[in-house]
């Protein structure tokens, strides 16, 4: 019987949380808290919004974003795209991994102009050491941050 | 090569399902089926709606609730909050872990007053032995139970 | 200390992606891409839309489907059911595992033509060797396929 090679190693895992600095408005990915509160990194690293893989393998990656607004003003995108994207040194552009499109404005009712919606993504992808995963939301102006529990980003090796 | 300490132990996991008794109307957390049908506990225990951790570590915790209604009568909350909360002996109040807010009433259309919506939460959190995780939904009157497949609560160690 | 039996084995995992052939219109389950792009099978097999278990155990199974449409006319399904179902040699009918009902047409506003919605399911279930899991969506006409990132189906042993 061959002893398991993962034996004494920790299984890579991370959970990053939304913070006031998450939304940059720069067209870049969302940024995340990595240490305070519920946030942690174990066997993964972080760089400018990205979870960086240090050990190759299959990972369940996930993200949730809390969306909200008041009414549906003209000029605001009627479709929200929330996605997890891979950056790899082997290719110049980000690669879509898991994506959702939603029309949250339809949540507003005649009696209540305030609406809330949530988008969750999760799935298993193969990641090589050095590859990065980021979260993007278009239009990010509709993302509602509060205390790190409503918008987050994480992964663990399976 | 150091042999893995988890070697002969089972990896803690649980999946609890919604039942007629889940909604108490008491302001407490949702209650769950732990044994019948698809429900099980393996290396975790259960107490009054809570998954109780017996082995410290990082856990992917998740919950889905099925929401539904007929129209959107005034007096019924236009915002639903669905969350996973931690109870710890070290702190008197529940701690928010993962939370979603939704406005499901916006699902009703002019032609169909009946609406359905679903809320899913999942993420990795660190839990100590003896700590508990519960699910709360406000307003729980909109939770639609049936056969344990539409509303559920689970966890597994990562 | 007993060495772990999983030692040198890979942990079963799979991620299958939506493709043009996914929607058959035959009343059967959705079909999936198993090899190209992000899709893979590791320690699980595939047959006619089903993930087939080769090693008994507890699995976290998940699926996301992207829904979309133009307007919400009467006659178009007002309720969408998205579910994961088990097929077992021990029982003639499919067994519901995880199910969501949504009313995505409520996403359309009076002025906004196009609506998008997404449904995510995930949970831990016990599966025996030879058992199968499939995804069904009713009404599947509203499922929007594109590039395998918006509708998918996967599992991994926990």
């Amino acid at each position: 019987l061959i002893q398991e090679r993962r034996s004494h190693e920790v299984n890579p895992a991370a959970h990053l949380t939304g913070a006031n600095s998450s939304l940059t408005g720069s067209g870049g990915p969302l940024l995340w808290e990595t240490q305070l509160g519920l946030a942690f990194l174990r066997g993964l690293s972080y760089h400018d919004g990205a979870l960086v893989v240090t050990k190759a393998g299959y990972y369940y990656i996930y993200s949730k974003v809390q969306l909200g607004g008041v009414g549906c003003p003209l000029g605001l995108a009627s479709t929200i795209t929330h996605g997890l994207y891979k950056r790899t040194p082997r290719y110049p552009e980000e690669l879509e991994l898991l994506v959702s499109q939603q029309s949250p404005c339809g949540r507003a009712t005649s009696s209540s102009r305030v609406w809330w919606d949530s988008s969750f993504l999760g799935g298993v992808v193969h990641l090589e050491a050095g590859e990065e995963v980021v979260v993007r939301v278009l239009d990010e102006r509709l993302v509602r941050l509060r205390d790190g529990t409503r918008s987050y980003f994480g992964a663990f090796m399976v | 090569l150091i042999q893995e300490r988890r070697s002969h132990e089972v990896n803690p996991a649980a999946h609890l399902t919604g039942a007629n008794s889940s909604l108490t109307g008491s302001g407490g957390p949702l209650l769950w089926e732990t044994q019948l049908g698809l429900a099980f506990l393996r290396g975790l225990s259960y107490h009054d709606g809570a998954l109780v951790v017996t082995k410290a570590g990082y856990y992917y915790i998740y919950s889905k609730v099925q929401l539904g209604g007929v129209g959107c009568p005034l007096g019924l909350a236009s915002t639903i909050t669905h969350g996973l909360y931690k109870r710890t002996p070290r702190y008197p109040e529940e701690l928010e872990l993962l939370v979603s807010q939704q406005s499901p009433c916006g699902r009703a259309t002019s032609s169909s007053r009946v609406w359905w919506d679903s809320s899913f939460l999942g993420g990795v959190v660190h839990l100590e032995a003896g700590e508990e995780v519960v699910v709360r939904v406000l307003d729980e009157r909109l939770v639609r139970l049936r056969d344990g497949t539409r509303s559920y609560f689970g966890a597994f160690m990562v | 200390l007993i060495q772990e039996r999983r030692s040198h084995e890979v942990n079963p995992a799979a991620h299958l992606t939506g493709a043009n052939s996914s929607l058959t219109g035959s009343g059967g389950p959705l079909l999936w891409e198993t090899q190209l792009g992000l899709a893979f099978l590791r320690g699980l097999s595939y047959h006619d839309g089903a993930l087939v278990v080769t090693k008994a155990g507890y699995y976290y199974i998940y699926s996301k489907v992207q829904l979309g449409g133009v307007g919400c006319p009467l006659g178009l399904a007002s309720t969408i059911t998205h579910g994961l179902y088990k097929r077992t040699p021990r029982y003639p009918e499919e067994l519901e595992l995880l199910v969501s009902q949504q009313s995505p047409c409520g996403r359309a506003t009076s002025s906004s033509r196009v609506w998008w919605d997404s449904s995510f399911l995930g949970g831990v279930v016990h599966l025996e060797a030879g058992e199968e899991v499939v995804v069904r969506v009713l009404d599947e006409r509203l499922v929007r396929l594109r590039d395998g990132t918006r509708s998918y189906f996967g599992a991994f042993m926990v």
């Epitope: - | - | 919400c72 033509r113 196009v114």
Partner: antibody, heavy 122, light 107 residues
Framework: QVQLQESGPGLVKPSGTLSLTCAVS?????????WNWVRQPPGKGLEWIGE???????NCNPSLKSRVTISVDKSKNQFSLKMNSVTAADTAVYYC???????????????WGQGTTVTVSS | DIQMTQSPSSLSASVGDRVSITCQAS??????LNWYQQKPGKAPKLLIY???NLETGVPSRFSGSGSGTDFTFTISSLQPEDIATYYC?????????FGGGTKVEIK
């Protein structure tokens, strides 16, 4: 493949009612497509009038809504346009056209009739 | 209503030239934009849907790009049979609205 054919009077008196029918052939009006009316005044651009689904659900241009009725007859595989209180400004070529599927997310008007000229004059 | 502003309103180019037409929406319409060709005395014909997708059977010299509020329609190499008026149309919001059209002629 699907073909559309408009029919109706070519001349309508002011304040009268314009009535047009569009016959669908080569396919069923009970598909998930929306069925549209578009018009084009002489020498001008295109204006959307409205649409109907086989179940009877309709949407109309707000600028015309008070005067327009769109209906469907599934037994005859056709849909119709009625516009009342017409004036010379309603003189145009009227097209029926198939829109995108309700169970779809693009809305190209991909099949058109050849158009019928309606003149409003006494 | 969403206003669709097309420019130029007319253009003249030589056979083989690259021709571009722009369409600007008065608000963000994502990629919910189509392009049509209308030859004199004929019904419009759908060429491009969802801003950049070529309708089946349409020659590859036609293309579209853009998202949000600014869109471009291009004929990579103008052919004599391309003489027509071209219209953009949005379907993000009701009512569906068209641009004013661009008349393309051969020099």
């Amino acid at each position: 493949q699907v073909q559309l054919q408009e029919s109706g009077p070519g001349l309508v008196k002011p304040s009268g009612t314009l009535s047009l029918t569009c016959a669908v052939s080569g396919g069923s009006i009970s598909s998930t497509h929306w069925w549209n009316w578009v018009r084009q005044p002489p020498g001008k651009g295109l204006e959307w009038i409205g649409e109907i689904y086989h179940s009877g659900s309709t949407n109309c241009n707000p600028s015309l809504k008070s005067r327009v009725t769109i209906s469907v007859d599934k037994s005859k595989n056709q849909f119709s346009l009625k516009m009342n209180s017409v004036t010379a400004a309603d003189t145009a070529v009227y097209y029926c056209t198939r829109g995108g599927a309700a169970a779809g997310t693009n809305y190209g008007l991909d099949v058109w009739g050849q158009g019928t000229t309606v003149t409003v004059s006494s | 209503d969403i206003q669709m502003t097309q420019s130029p309103s007319s253009l003249s180019a030589s056979v083989g030239d690259r021709v571009s037409i722009t369409c600007q929406a008065s608000q963000d319409i994502s990629n919910y934009l189509n392009w049509y060709q209308q030859k004199p005395g004929k019904a419009p014909k759908l060429l491009i849907y969802d801003a950049s997708n070529l309708e089946t059977g349409v020659p590859s010299r036609f293309s579209g790009s853009g998202s949000g509020t600014d869109f471009t329609f291009t004929i990579s190499s103008l052919q004599p049979e391309d003489i027509a008026t071209y219209y953009c149309q949005q379907y993000d919001n009701l009512p569906l609205t068209f641009g004013g059209g661009t008349k393309v002629e051969i020099k």
